[in-house]
């Protein structure tokens, strides 16, 4: 499943954040004209992934891949041949299930976020990791940081690169 | 995507190997009448996953899941709704792309194997992990071990459990 077919710039940013790759994150954020406060907010999220080590990146990448390739994201877009299969439930827009997950990651409670992840990947190690990341983000980010992250996400979702 | 619908015994063996579960591996190998040398060969592969820890299992599971749910594997079997999606490109036979990946894992060079994985999952962390596993298998397994692993795979592919 080619996630990049839905909203490539979103996945660029996600994997740059999750892989702790500052260079790739800067490159991706420049493409969507991120402000300094928006960059700062994303780097706080990135710090959580880096602090939690490689396993964190992989497990959360696994969650993202799983949600993105789930029935909820593949929606009505299945053609009669796999050749034409696309994830674009809404043109090239990001899948609503992914959007919901990201929103809960920023604005929901740890329980709400972990429950949403559990719908897609219920391995205990995955859920523990999701909670650790969520708690880290809640501890590191101010309300203002979260608002900046949400405004950046809006830029991403409405970007021509999405 | 239900991989088990294509060749359940193959995925039983793969996940037993990748998860370092000796008991499950023994059970699965008994079902296909594996010889002692064939068991030894599979256990050497399993050792590589165990030595490389949880991260290795998760990442390689991600690769296998991705290849198994790729366009190359979904073949002509797509229905009009995702609900009915099946992988059975050739009845219940294993997908050729999965077969090719496993063959390269055993008989190809590290470059050849990683390049094939890269067609499905181009994250650096996934590809580095694939190379580490491949290097380990090349170091641990003799030519005879590899021949035994290939003969076991033939038994799996032609088994009524596939």
């Amino acid at each position: 499943v080619k996630m990049a077919e839905t909203c490539p710039i979103f996945y660029d940013v996600f994997f740059a954040v999750a892989n702790g790759n500052e260079l790739l994150l800067d490159l991706s954020l420049t493409k969507v004209n991120a402000t300094e406060p928006e960059r700062t907010a994303m780097k706080k999220i990135q710090d959580c992934y880096v602090e939690n080590g490689l396993i964190s990146r992989v497990l959360d990448g696994l969650v993202m891949t799983t949600i993105s390739s789930s029935k909820d994201c593949m929606g009505e877009a299945v053609q009669n041949t796999v050749e034409d299969l696309k994830l674009n439930t809404l043109g090239r827009e990001i899948c609503p299930a992914v959007k919901r997950g990201v929103d809960l990651f920023l604005t929901g409670t740890p329980d709400e976020y972990v429950e949403q992840v559990a719908q897609y990947k219920a391995l205990p190690v995955v859920l523990e990791n999701a909670r650790i990341l969520k708690n880290c983000v809640d501890a590191k980010m101010t309300e203002e940081d979260k608002e900046n992250a949400l405004s950046l996400l809006d830029k991403i979702y409405t970007s021509p690169l999405c | 995507v239900k991989m088990a619908e294509t060749c359940p015994i193959f995925y039983d063996v793969f996940f037993a190997v990748a998860n370092g579960n000796e008991l499950l591996l023994d059970l699965s190998l008994t079902k296909v009448n594996a010889t002692e040398p064939e068991r030894t060969a599979m256990k050497k592969i399993q050792d590589c996953y165990v030595e490389n820890g949880l991260i290795s299992r998760v990442l390689d599971g991600l690769v296998m899941t991705t290849i198994s749910s790729s366009k190359d594997c979904m073949g002509e079997a797509v229905q009009n709704t995702v609900e009915d999606l099946k992988l059975n490109t050739l009845g219940r036979e294993i997908c050729p792309a999965v077969k090719r990946g496993v063959d390269l894992f055993l008989t190809g060079t590290p470059d050849e194997y990683v390049e094939q994985v890269a067609q499905y999952k181009a994250l650096p962390v996934v590809l580095e992990n694939a190379r580490i596993l491949k290097n380990c298998v090349d170091a641990k397994m003799t030519e005879e071990d590899k021949e035994n692993a290939l003969s076991l795979l033939d038994k799996i592919y032609t088994s009524p459990l596939c």
Partner: antibody
């Protein structure tokens, strides 16, 4: 097997230019990021530049930015390093190296190296 | 740039010895670390990547460990072919940076 052969080194005066080439064989050239790494006489290794597998991104160490340009020709399996405004401190053996991992190319792990070509900047 | 510091700079050892080289990063590089071996007049050779992953064809006596800022390269039983200079290199960022090298010489 993977073979990388550098050429174009030599003695050059400060302020002048030189172009290094690296011919690659034995692998799918267009799938890999390629790098230049240098080593001053008796010193350690210093990464100089990278070009991604498709030429879409190029990065340089700060000390050569604006003076050196990396490029590639995927049809001829060759990468180049155009070195302008050379300085004495650019004196080094220049190695061409291939990224270990294909396509992603973002991780600068140097899996394969050429034998190197010596560049001497001296008046 | 991330600074990589190796210790010791020179190490005298005998065949059969267990040898350990340390590499410290000025900030966390997670597991994105490689080790290289270089012999005089030759190009470096990749030994280990992702902190502990052995490259193809490298003997099992070489092993790597560590994450974050502290890493080690261990040679379990030094062989005559192992006398060389060893470099660590982080690849968490561009620019990738190398340690200054550790020369392993015959005691």
């Amino acid at each position: 097997q993977v073979v990388l052969v550098e050429s174009g080194g030599g003695v050059v005066q400060p302020g002048r230019s030189l172009r290094l080439s690296c011919a690659a064989s034995g692998f799918t050239f267009s799938s890999y990021g390629m790098h230049w790494v240098r080593q001053a006489p008796g010193k350690g290794l210093e990464w100089v530049a990278v070009i991604w597998y498709d030429g879409s991104n190029k990065y340089y160490v700060d000390s050569v930015k604006g003076r050196f340009t990396i490029s590639r020709d995927n049809s001829n399996n060759t990468i180049y390093l155009q070195m302008n405004s050379l300085r004495a401190e650019d004196t080094a053996v220049y190695y061409c190296a291939r990224s270990l991992i294909p396509v992603a190319g973002t991780d600068p792990i140097f899996g394969y190296w050429g034998q190197g070509t010596l560049v001497t900047v001296s008046s | 740039d991330i600074q990589m510091t190796q210790s010791p700079s020179t190490l005298s050892a005998s065949v059969g010895d267990r040898v350990t080289i340390t590499c410290r990063a000025s900030q966390s590089v997670s597991s994105w670390l490689a080790w290289y071996q270089q012999k005089p007049g030759k190009a470096p050779k990749l030994l280990i990547f992702k902190a502990s992953g052995l490259e193809s064809g490298v003997p099992f006596r070489f092993s790597g460990s560590g994450s974050g800022t502290e890493f080690t390269l261990t040679i379990s039983s030094l062989q005559p072919d192992d006398f060389a200079t060893y470099y660590c290199q982080q690849y968490n960022t561009y620019s990738p940076t190398f340690g200054q090298g550790t020369k392993v010489e015959i005691k």
